[in-house]
């Protein structure tokens, strides 16, 4: 059984389509390992060296290239999604120097809600996206990005902050989710897995992708992040899945080629400005959207998540570089830096396109679509 392919998608050159590429056995959760599949490793599982290798008026238009995936999320085979954990599964690590609970890490103790109570909130991120249950919202218009094509100077700070690799963005990158929903980009960072283990934060029908990019934005209604935290729509994140394709992605290479310089936790380097929009899929019109939270402590809610339907393709070597270069706390590899998917708790994920409508009629199991709350806007 497959999720339907949307006929209006124009095929892109390059990468293999998930349509002809069913999920392998390792992606199918079994009874005994489904909690582990959904849960980042505990302290005892943290990978070490021995395991290797192994957030304008019109959208900027860029030509469809071999660097973008032809796979669309609705093309994925249907896989039974693991049940959402009833309690947040993420843990932080008690700092060895004392009881400071704010020194969170992926894996270990204490639980994140002890680090920040908001992490036990009801509307957390990431989530599992089930396209057939998404509410089609025609009011969700194509995203508008302005000023994302940066000149080489001034250079940008690329930092290994111990949890991810983060690129700090300069003022002037404007993004609109729709009329009156305007934001400024602040930074971008990535989440990834390890050799042979995918590391995206969001999942689709239980399928985890190799990696995920987050571009974090602040609403123009606020001057500073601390004012916006926890306020509905105060922050917005554009998220895209990264997948393996046959070609090197030249946009990502501008960052990945510099990772060795920041291998050590806390280190940073300066990189020339680049086209930030080239790190995202080219199709700004097809996406999923829901209200959630930051995926790391303090896990503040009210964050508008926009997850692109189209994926971005990187070469196998590039994905390996991403997951195998950086070091995190305590002389451990910076890997598997993703949070477990969180329960929707009644939230409805909206889609800007009819993601849950099959292009060919089915004899059985008619799809029940959720209604769009924003349809009248």
């Amino acid at each position: 059984q497959r999720l339907p392919r949307m006929q209006e998608d124009s095929p892109l050159g390059g990468g293999s389509s998930g349509e002809d590429d069913p999920l392998g056995e390792e992606d199918l959760p079994s009874e005994e390992d489904s909690p582990r599949e959904e849960d980042p490793p505990g302290e005892e599982d943290l990978p070490g060296e021995e395991d290797l290798p192994g957030e304008e008026d019109l959208p900027e238009v860029k030509p469809k290239s071999e660097e973008e995936g032809s796979l669309k999320l609705e093309d994925l085979p249907t896989v039974e999604a693991p049940g959402d954990p009833q309690e947040p599964q993420n843990n932080a690590h008690r700092d060895k120097e004392g009881d400071d609970q704010s020194h969170w890490r992926y894996g270990g103790d204490p639980p994140w809600p002890r680090v920040s109570p908001a992490c036990a909130g009801r509307f957390q991120s990431p989530v599992d996206i089930r396209p057939q249950l998404a509410a089609f919202c025609p009011a969700l218009r194509p995203l508008e990005l302005l000023g994302f094509q940066l000149p080489p100077l001034p250079e940008l700070r690329l930092r290994n902050n111990g949890h991810s690799v983060q690129l700090t963005l300069p003022p002037g990158l404007e993004m609109a989710l729709g009329p009156g929903r305007e934001y400024r980009a602040l930074q971008l960072h990535l989440h990834w897995g390890a050799a042979g283990r995918p590391g995206s934060e969001h999942t689709v029908e239980g399928h985890r992708f190799p990696a995920e990019i987050h571009v974090v934005h602040l609403s123009t209604a606020f001057a500073r992040v601390d004012e916006a935290l926890g306020r509905p729509g105060g922050l917005a994140v554009l998220a895209a899945f990264l997948e393996e394709g046959p070609e090197e992605n030249s946009a990502y290479e501008q960052l990945l080629s510099r990772l060795e310089e920041i291998a050590e936790e806390g280190s940073e380097t300066q990189v020339p400005g680049l086209d930030i929009s080239a790190l995202l899929p080219s199709d700004f019109s097809r996406y999923f959207q829901y209200e959630g939270s930051l995926t790391t402590p303090p896990c503040a809610q009210g964050v508008i998540w926009t997850v692109f339907n189209q994926t971005v393709m990187l070469s196998a070597k590039q994905l390996h570089t991403l997951s195998d270069t950086l070091w995190g706390p305590g002389d451990s590899r910076l890997q598997l830096n993703f949070r477990a998917t969180q329960p929707l708790n009644g939230r409805v994920i909206e889609a800007s396109f009819p993601a849950g409508v099959d292009s060919s009629p089915r004899a059985a199991e008619p799809v029940q679509l959720n209604s769009c709350l924003a349809a009248g806007d």
Epitope: E97, G162, D226, G266
Partner: nanobody, 117 residues
Framework: EVQLLESGGGLVQPGGSLRLSCAAS???????????MSWYRQAPGKGLELVAV???????KYSDSVKGRFTISRDNSKNTLYLQMNSLRAEDTAVYYC????????WGQGTQVTVSS
């Protein structure tokens, strides 16, 4: 709104020591604990130079020019960042700025450190 206030700068002789502090205040959601904290400095006529970083996990990183002489630390319970500077040299003379990196950069106003005999 979050404010960072540096203190502890001053005039010191070569070989002497100073301890800089950076106190964070004013934030309703305590982002200090979740920010990578840094000390930068700017010498007269020069650009901004990263001196030291401490991540949320307590990991530290120093510029080569201060390694072994300076120590960065943080006390999240007091929302305070520190920089212990020993064996000070004339070339350490600069305005020292505290930085909190949490989704965006927050900066202090700076504190002057002058190393001179």
């Amino acid at each position: 709104e979050v404010q960072l206030l540096e203190s502890g700068g001053g005039l010191v002789q070569p070989g002497g020591s100073l301890r800089l502090s950076c106190a964070a205040s004013g934030n309703s959601v305590n982002i200090f604990s979740f920010a990578a904290m840094s000390w930068y400095r700017q010498a007269p006529g020069k650009g901004l130079e990263l001196v030291a970083v401490i991540t949320t996990t307590g990991g530290t990183k120093y510029s080569d020019s201060v390694k072994g002489r300076f120590t960065i630390s943080r006390d999240n319970s007091k929302n305070t960042l520190y920089l212990q500077m020993n064996s000070l040299r004339a070339e350490d003379t600069a305005v020292y700025y505290c930085n909190a990196d949490y989704l965006q950069d927050y900066w202090g106003q700076g504190t002057q450190v002058t190393v001179s005999s």
